[in-house]
Each structure stands twice: as C-alpha cells, then as structure tokens.
C-alpha cells in the first residue's frame, strides 16, 4: 500500500510499520483482499524481531501471512524476495500436501499456535494480519 505519516486508528505501530490484527477468520484470498481495501497488505515478515512482535500479538491461533505459492514458487505479497529472506517454518514444512484435491498443494502460509510457519489449504478460516509501511520520508530530517 501507499506510505503513511502515522498509523490509522486501531492499528499498532512498530518499527516504521503499522499492523492490524484481525479477530475473526477468513480464507486467505478474502484476508488478502481485506488488507488491500485498507491500502495495506498481508503481513510480510522480514526479521526475527518482526516475527516475535507479530507472534506476541496474535497469540496461539492460526493466522495468515502474506506468503503463498499459488503460482509456483513461494512469494511474498509485497515482492520481498523469499529465497534470501527470513523464514521460520515448522520442521518438515512447507510440505505442500497434495492430497486435498484442490488443485495444486497447500498454497498459503500461516503462523501456527507456536508462531512457526506452516502451509495449508487457502480456504481455511484463519485470522490474519495486515501491514502497511509508514511514510519513510517523514521520518528523515528535512533537506536544507
């Protein structure tokens, strides 16, 4: 989404980003759309510090993040590079289990009850987290 100078009401500011934590559950695509309508995106986890922050706020409930492999390779919704980026998968995950007959495998990533990541079928009604970046320019000293 576009950058902001301050976080919207009911969003939590952390390290120059704003986060909104859902209480209800939605399928991944519906959650993704919800965040986009808020001029944001599903959360993109880029560091262990950010992982701990999100984990603290979501508690022990499966929660969608902005990571999927619905078109082949794993991709973050904001374009952050998956291969070189932070990862926190559970052991043996992602397993991309193909037995569900949905076409493709388990294509969407979520935080599990212990915070580590798992891939699951995208229609599951999990909570989700939206993220949007604060206006970085407003954080810098003005040019003289």
């Amino acid at each position: 989404g576009s950058e902001r100078a301050c976080c919207p009401v009911n969003w939590v500011e952390h390290e120059r980003s704003c986060y909104w934590f859902s209480r209800s559950g939605k399928a991944w695509a519906d959650a993704d759309n919800y965040c986009r309508l808020e001029d944001a995106h599903l959360v993109v986890v880029t560091s262990w510090e950010e992982q701990k922050f999100v984990q603290h706020h979501i508690g022990p409930v499966n929660t969608w993040m902005g990571l999927h492999d619905q078109n082949g390779p794993w991709k973050w919704v904001d374009g952050t590079d998956y291969e070189t980026g932070f990862k926190n998968w559970r052991p043996e995950q992602p397993d991309d289990w193909y037995g569900h007959g949905l076409g493709g495998g388990e294509d969407c990533a979520h935080f599990t009850d212990d915070g580590r990541w798992n891939d699951d079928v995208c229609q599951r009604p999990y909570r989700w987290v939206c993220e949007t970046e604060l206006d970085k320019a407003s954080q810098e000293p003005p040019l003289l």
């Epitope: 409930v61 289990w97 037995g99 007959g101 949905l102 388990e106 079928v121 229609q123 599951r124 009604p125």
Partner: antibody
C-alpha cells in the same frame, strides 16, 4: 471427565423465541471453540453455528442466519443459542459440541441434546 | 457450500464382516474430514478426525483413508455394538457440512 449438558428446550409457537444453554465441565472452557448442531426427527445432522474460544468469531448456517445468535460466558463455562422467529422446520434435537481447538478444528465432545418443538 | 454425499445410505452386514462406507465431497477439503457414529436416541460420538486420526478411546478396528474428494471409513470386523448410523463431516471451511448418513444394520 469432559461433559456438556444442554438445557432450555421445549415446545414453542412459530414466531416465538427460545434460549438454549450448554453447561461445560471437566475442561478449560475458555480454550475451546464451541458449536451447535441439530437433528430434525428422523433426519441427519445439520451444523448450526460456531463461536471461537474467546467469542471473537461467529459463523452460522444460512438456514438460521439473522434469527439465531450464538454466545458464550467463559466465566460461567456456558454456551448459549438465542433462537428468534422460530419456524416449524427448526424442530429438532439441539446438541452442543466442543471444537478440538479454538473454533476451526472439528468436533470431538458432544452433549446429550435438548429437544425443541415448534408447533402451533 | 460443500456438499457431502455418503454411500450407501444403508447396508446390512453380519458380525465379523469388514464394512466400508464412502464419503464424496463436492470439492477438495484437504485433510479436514471427520467421522461420527450415532446410535438411536443418543448423541453422536466422534470416531476419526483429519481423515485417519483416531479419537481418544476409539478402537483401532475403525480406520479412515482417502484424499481429494473421496474418503472411506472402514470397520475391520463388525461387532454388535457397531450397528449404528455413521456420518462424515467436512470442517475445512464454514459452514461445516455433514453427509446424509449410512445406517449399518444387522443382516
């Protein structure tokens, strides 16, 4: 042991209201999602509603949406189903059932059921 | 909504028989399938979840298998206490939906 006991059923006229209760014991109620499932006489099982462990998420079957409300009081270990604008087709045995997790993990423990009859 | 179709709707079998009940879903449901047993006048009892995982206290003569849209419940050696109606249920997404039931009767 884990136990669910429903109450509040009875005979009611069409258009009237009824509130069912489900008293839980033997487990940490506030950690589990809860469901209502019903069974019309001689018919199969029909899921009615779910409420997540903390009350944050509620979902309903289309057949009851806008008429029934699921709620819970974790301090009293009790689940409720408020049924308004009752119809003859709501006649059934109503079961409360525990979710295996917070609300999206399927059912494991069931109550014995309470009978609701909607008739004029 | 996801439709659940059970077959057969009823079957007659003898003690000791191996019985198989099939559940077909209108779309893939991942591993989010459960089986329940219900005896007349009683509440349903959970047998299996996640297709093949036995609920605590359920004997191993009950087993589940399948993937995609086709699932089966097998009772390896039918005993008198197993004569009942069996239901499959998907819990991949809301609304949760049940199959129409399979009544297992004594031959």
């Amino acid at each position: 042991q884990v136990q669910l006991v429903e109450s509040g059923g009875g005979v009611v006229q069409p258009g009237r209201s009824l509130r069912l209760s489900c008293a839980a014991s033997g487990f940490t109620f506030s950690s589990y999602g809860m469901h209502w499932v019903r069974q019309a006489p001689g018919k199969g099982l029909e899921w009615v509603a779910v409420i997540w462990y903390d009350g944050s998420n509620k979902n309903y079957a289309d057949s009851v949406k806008g008429r029934f409300t699921i709620s819970r009081d974790n301090s009293k270990n009790t689940l409720y189903l408020q049924m308004n604008s009752l119809r003859a087709e709501d006649t059934a045995v109503y079961y409360c059932a525990r979710d295996q997790g917070v609300g999206y993990d399927g059912l494991d423990v069931w109550g014995q059921g309470t009978t609701v009859t909607v008739s004029s | 909504d996801i439709q659940m179709t059970q077959s057969p709707s009823s079957l007659s079998a003898s003690v000791g028989d191996r019985v198989t009940i099939t559940c077909r879903t209108s779309q893939g449901i991942g591993k989010y399938l459960a089986w329940f047993q219900q005896k007349p006048g009683k509440a349903p009892k959970s047998l299996l979840y996640k297709v093949s995982s036995l609920q605590s206290g359920v004997p191993s003569k009950f087993s589940g298998s399948g993937s995609g849209t086709d699932f089966t419940l097998t009772i390896s050696s039918l005993q008198p206490e197993d004569f009942a109606t069996y239901y499959c249920q998907q819990y991949m997404t809301y609304p949760l939906t049940f199959g129409g039931g399979t009544k297992v009767e004594i031959k």
